[in-house]
């Protein structure tokens, strides 16, 4: 058998083919699907197979991250002759089969999207009756989740020599630009840290030395919106403590 990737420009599908003179498997998935956090998304997946009129037991599987070995997020099974694919697994109850596997459609709906859902997903179908065969998408579909900025943490922390620093962490996709404003600051980008590995949607900005008392505001902005949060610094003059 040969597996190839054919990019069909007219419908932007990845078509994966598994063929020999007598049989042919193929799976069609788009390279990417985009949706906003909080909304729902549909991951399309259709397939063709060489087992004409197959009516035996089948399983439909969707997994995340990597093909063949990634964690399953959805699985359903249909009994012989049945068009009902009974859900056996739906991670956090947010995954639902839209397509009918008996009609070669494994399309999946993902509800209440979160930034953590921004991954690659792989569909798989398994036959297990008189016919024993299965096929899985190798390239998968990238679910791109966008989100307006949200400030997840803002704080003032002690620094050496009785100084203070401020940290602001925000999430969003595209990753938001952060800016600090405050006493004697104007508007400052202030030591923005790039998204950390494993936390690709989080961005942190630090104000390394707060020199004046008052209100410090962190603003996060991307193409979908902006968000801001403030922290107050008040030092007891003549003492080493501070109130924030």
């Amino acid at each position: 058998f040969v597996r190839t990737k054919i990019d069909t420009t007219e419908n932007l599908l990845n078509t994966e083919v598994h063929s020999s003179p007598a049989q042919r498997w193929s799976m069609q998935v788009p390279p990417e699907v985009s949706a906003e956090a909080g909304d729902a998304a549909v991951l399309p997946c259709t397939f063709t197979h060489p087992h004409r009129h197959y009516d035996g037991p089948l399983t439909a599987i969707w997994r995340a991250g990597e093909p063949y070995a990634g964690p399953q997020v959805f699985r359903c099974a249909a009994a012989r002759g049945s068009e009902l694919c009974q859900t056996a697994l739906s991670l956090h109850g947010r995954f639902r089969l839209l397509g009918n596997p008996r009609r070669n459609d494994l399309s999946l709906r993902v509800e209440r999207l979160a930034l953590a859902d921004d991954r690659r997903y792989f569909c798989r179908v398994e036959f297990a009756g008189d016919v024993h065969d299965r096929y899985e998408s190798r390239h998968g579909v990238r679910l791109h989740v966008t989100a307006a900025p949200r400030i997840v943490n803002i704080s003032v922390l002690p620094s050496p020599a009785h100084a203070f620093r401020a940290l602001c962490t925000a999430e969003g996709e595209p990753p938001p630009a952060l800016a600090w404003s405050g006493p004697a600051l104007g508007n400052s980008l202030a030591a923005v840290r790039s998204p950390r590995e494993g936390h690709g949607h989080l961005v942190t900005a630090e104000l390394p030395a707060l020199t004046h008392d008052g209100r410090y505001t962190c603003t996060a902005a991307n193409s979908l919106g902006r968000s801001e949060a403030s922290v107050y610094l008040f030092r007891f003059h003549g003492a080493s403590g501070a109130s924030t």
Partner: antibody, heavy 122, light 107 residues
Framework: EVQLLESGGGLVQPGGSLRLSCAAS????????MSWVRQAPGKGLEWVST????????YYADSVKGRFTISRDNSKNTLYLQMNSLRAEDTAVYYC???????????????WGQGTMVTVSS | DIQMTQSPSSVSASVGDRVTITCRAS??????LAWYQQKPGKAPKLLIY???YIHSGVPSRFSGSGSGTDFTLTISSLQPEDFATYYC?????????FGQGTKLEIK
């Protein structure tokens, strides 16, 4: 910790019976097909049997068909192999193994137990 | 049943060498092939699945290729811990079958 732990091996006479167990932990047991693979002393690996995640289907090597029965108790995260009418050629280390990414198919065995020795001798 | 034939049955090599082990199936098995490493007294460990996917935690010096009937496992630069026996296994159809093994020894 993700692991498989076999037990139940031992010395048995030809024609006798033995029941092997494999306790699984650290993963969702019912989501994966499970198998038994054996290895005779100084020999290679031989697939023995597979059971689907929900226990709907079982498969056997011809050499054990009708004598061995694979089963699972998903509430106890345990896989079993009931071996009857044992023969000298069944002498081997028996491993339980987890399928990599499917409840119906074993694309590969990504997790193995440490093995339990079964000796069939008079 | 599908027969799996590995070659060579044994190979001697030195640390740093590049080693290739081949596995041939008696019929077309698409890409449904896995490779395992086994050391004496230990359980096998999965190295490669679906012909070319490296299992998590396996060093990148291991790679797999092939489809249809002919497959290879390559170790790009042998390390001391790589001396072991290697098995291929087809998962295309039941009964699942293994190759007879290739013993990799220190030269």
């Amino acid at each position: 910790e993700v692991q498989l732990l076999e037990s139940g091996g031992g010395l048995v006479q030809p024609g006798g019976s033995l029941r092997l167990s494999c306790a699984a932990s650290g993963f969702t047991f019912s989501s994966y097909a499970m198998s038994w693979v054996r290895q005779a002393p100084g020999k290679g690996l031989e697939w023995v049997s597979t059971i689907t995640g929900g226990g709907e289907s079982t498969y056997y090597a011809d050499s054990v068909k009708g004598r061995f029965t694979i089963s699972r108790d998903n509430s106890k995260n345990t896989l079993y192999l009931q071996m009857n009418s044992l023969r000298a050629e069944d002498t081997a280390v028996y491993y339980c193994a987890k399928a990599i990414g499917s409840s119906w198919y074993s694309d590969a065995f990504d997790l193995w137990g440490q093995g339990t020795m079964v000796t069939v001798s008079s | 049943d599908i027969q799996m034939t590995q070659s060579p049955s044994s190979v001697s090599a030195s640390v740093g060498d590049r080693v290739t082990i081949t596995c041939r199936a008696s019929q077309d098995i698409s890409s449904w092939l896995a490779w395992y490493q086994q050391k004496p007294g230990k359980a096998p460990k999965l190295l490669i699945y679906v012909a070319s996917y490296i299992h998590s935690g396996v060093p990148s010096r291991f790679s797999g290729s092939g489809s249809g009937t002919d497959f290879t496992l390559t170790i790009s630069s042998l390390q001391p811990e790589d001396f072991a026996t290697y098995y291929c296994q087809q998962s295309y159809s039941i009964p699942y079958t293994f190759g007879q093994g290739t013993k990799l020894e220190i030269k």
